[in-house]
């Protein structure tokens, strides 16, 4: 079940040729677009095995990230895909092409991408509304104890300046709909509810619109009653991963718990050819557990370095407290090394996805 949803308009695929080495291409894509980056060999000659890197980390091919020797395609782009991309020679790590990619919530206009970033910087915004601080909007599930104050923000811009309105569970939401009222701060694009109670649970949607279009974001609020309950794990995490042999992988797990949670990362294993014990419970090994000295942020990420084929399999994030425990699992698929993918690519199979 999706706890937070964004309404996305799927745009066209924009393939962008690479800049001259040393230059940085500034690119803007709309949410949902297919980002295609092309890096032809300098002078048209052969350039040997290459790697694609985002923000300093090697990109792992997946169903959404398609890696070819001279081309990178990221399907259904989202804010998280913004960043600095480069294509490098595998052996020398020399940067062949460099791109700065920004993915906005406004679907791309279809015009020439070049200069869109600059136009925005000079204050000439595109007509339709877009999110100005998408990184502040990625916490779509909010679980807070009763009596706390909750603020939802949807900072946006557009030309003309868009209006913002709020829905609760799909219906217009006004102050008289809750005891204690609400504070609408239009300058800050925010909705504030003080001293939340269980009846405040639900889906809250900001609708930002002007004459050129509208965008919306939905947040889910869960109000935790003081009678404690077992931890809540964010839906969709950890997510299935596909990695190339020797690359690094991260699994993420977001835990919400009123009582102090104890978190474990487990890997499912086989014992004497069986995946489950005599009582039907799966065999596991503990990879990482909570510590008083370990921050929540560290615990919410399981990092696997230089993965091997033995690392493939099922991983579980498990969180417990005095009431009980919750667990979510994901799978890791490990593909052969990239040289093999490149060979396959040159044989006519364009992407290893």
């Amino acid at each position: 079940e999706s706890l937070g949803t964004e309404q996305r308009v799927v745009g066209r695929a924009a393939e962008v040729p690479g800049p001259e080495p040393g230059q940085q291409e500034q690119l803007v894509f709309g949410s949902g677009d297919a980002v295609e980056l092309s890096c032809p060999p300098p002078g048209g000659g052969p350039m040997g095995p290459t790697v694609w890197v985002k923000d300093g980390t090697g990109l792992v091919p997946s169903e959404r990230v398609l890696v070819g020797p001279q081309r990178l395609q990221v399907l259904n782009a989202s804010h998280e895909d913004s960043g600095a991309y480069s294509c490098r020679q595998r052996l020398t790590q020399r940067v062949l092409c460099h791109f700065s990619v920004r993915v906005t919530d406004a679907p791309s206009s279809g015009d020439d991408e070049d200069g869109e970033d600059e136009a925005e910087d000079t204050g000439v915004d595109t007509g339709a509304p877009y999110w100005t601080r998408p990184e502040r909007m990625d916490k779509k599930l909010l679980a807070v104890p009763a009596a706390n104050t909750v603020r939802f923000r949807c900072p946006a811009a557009g030309n003309p300046t868009p209006s913002i309105s709020w829905l609760k569970n799909g219906r217009e939401f006004r102050g008289e709909h809750r005891i204690g009222g609400i504070k609408l701060r239009h300058q800050q694009w925010s909705l504030v509810m003080e001293s939340v109670v269980p009846s405040d649970r639900g889906n809250y949607t900001c609708v930002v619109e002007n004459k050129f279009g509208s965008i919306r974001q939905t947040y889910t609020l869960d109000v935790l009653e003081r009678s404690p309950h077992r931890p809540i794990l964010q839906a969709g995490l950890p997510a299935n991963q596909t990695a190339v042999l020797g690359s690094d992988v991260e699994f993420h797990c977001k835990v919400y718990s009123d009582a102090q949670p104890h978190i474990q990362w487990l890997k499912h294993v086989e014992v004497n050819g069986s995946k489950v014990g005599p009582d039907g419970t799966p065999y596991v090994t503990v990879l990482k557990t909570a510590g008083a000295n370990t921050t929540d942020k560290e615990l919410e990420v399981l990092s696997l370095h230089n993965v091997t084929f033995e690392d493939a399999g099922e991983y579980t994030c498990l969180a417990g407290n005095s009431i009980g425990f919750s667990h979510h699992s994901a799978w890791l698929v490990v593909l052969p090394a990239e040289e093999e993918l490149v060979e396959a690519d040159e044989a006519g199979s364009v992407y290893a996805g």
Partner: antibody, heavy 126, light 107 residues
Framework: QVQLVQSGAEVKKPGASVKVSCKAS????????MHWVRQAPGQGLEWMGW????????NYAQKFQGRVTMTRDTSISTAYMELSSLRSEDTAVYYC???????????????????WGQGTLVTVSS | DIELTQPPSVSVAPGQTARISCSGD??????ASWYQQKPGQAPVLVIY???DRPSGIPERFSGSNSGNTATLTISGTQAEDEADYYC?????????FGGGTKLTVLG
């Protein structure tokens, strides 16, 4: 807060059996594995085995196979350890200890004990 | 089966650093835990997963584990740290304890 409260001291004759109880409170009894550890006078800690209170599954140390039986009653959040064919060298303090292993899984590498009972002294003497 | 070996006793002056070792075949490939036990009391967890400290355990307790040896380090040892210390690890569904080390705080 988590508490493990064990039954009182026992004096038994060689060849008899003893059944020690361990009542858990402050957490969900069926969520975590329960282990039994014993300590003879002036000696070190010796692991005896575990029970999964959720499924009832058990695993005993080789040394105690055939003599020890671990059971549980989930309705009263209590684990039991019964040791039969007692001999004088079974004189020890017996501890129950909660393990940081969750009962939906069977751990190849069992983690640590975070809570212990107060111990039950079992004396075997003729 | 893995066997864990500890020195029977370690002595330290107050305020000094005490180190208690625990050796076992390829112990560094497994997690090690440490328990403190005072006379007439149940053991208390002081270090788990090699180096993590449960809440309520003073910062002077630390742990490490590599190769064949896990080490419990008590820096600035205090009189109240005098106790027996046991290392613990696992071996294929089973748990194993070291023989225990009596820590004496001199003076």
């Amino acid at each position: 807060q988590v508490q493990l409260v064990q039954s009182g001291a026992e004096v038994k004759k060689p060849g008899a059996s003893v059944k020690v109880s361990c009542k858990a409170s402050g957490y969900t009894f069926t969520s975590y594995y329960m282990h039994w550890v014993r300590q003879a006078p002036g000696q070190g800690l010796e692991w005896m085995g575990w029970i999964n209170p959720n499924s009832g599954g058990t695993n005993y140390a080789q040394k105690f196979q055939g003599r020890v039986t671990m059971t549980r009653d989930t309705s009263i959040s209590t684990a039991y350890m019964e040791l039969s064919s007692l001999r004088s060298e079974d004189t020890a303090v017996y501890y129950c200890a909660r393990n940081m292993a969750y009962t939906n899984y069977q751990y190849v590498n069992m983690p640590h004990f975070d809570y212990w009972g107060q111990g039950t002294l079992v004396t075997v003497s003729s | 089966d893995i066997e864990l070996t500890q020195p029977p006793s370690v002595s330290v002056a107050p305020g000094q650093t005490a180190r208690i070792s625990c050796s076992g075949d390829a112990l560094g490939d497994k997690y090690a835990s440490w328990y403190q036990q005072k006379p007439g009391q149940a053991p208390v967890l002081v270090i788990y997963d090699d180096s993590d400290r449960p809440s309520g355990i003073p910062e002077r307790f630390s742990g490490s584990n590599s190769g064949n040896t896990a080490t419990l380090t008590i820096s600035g040892t205090q009189a109240e740290d005098e106790a027996d210390y046991y290392c613990q690890s696992y071996d294929y569904f089973k748990l194993v304890f070291g023989g225990g080390t009596k820590l004496t705080v001199l003076g």
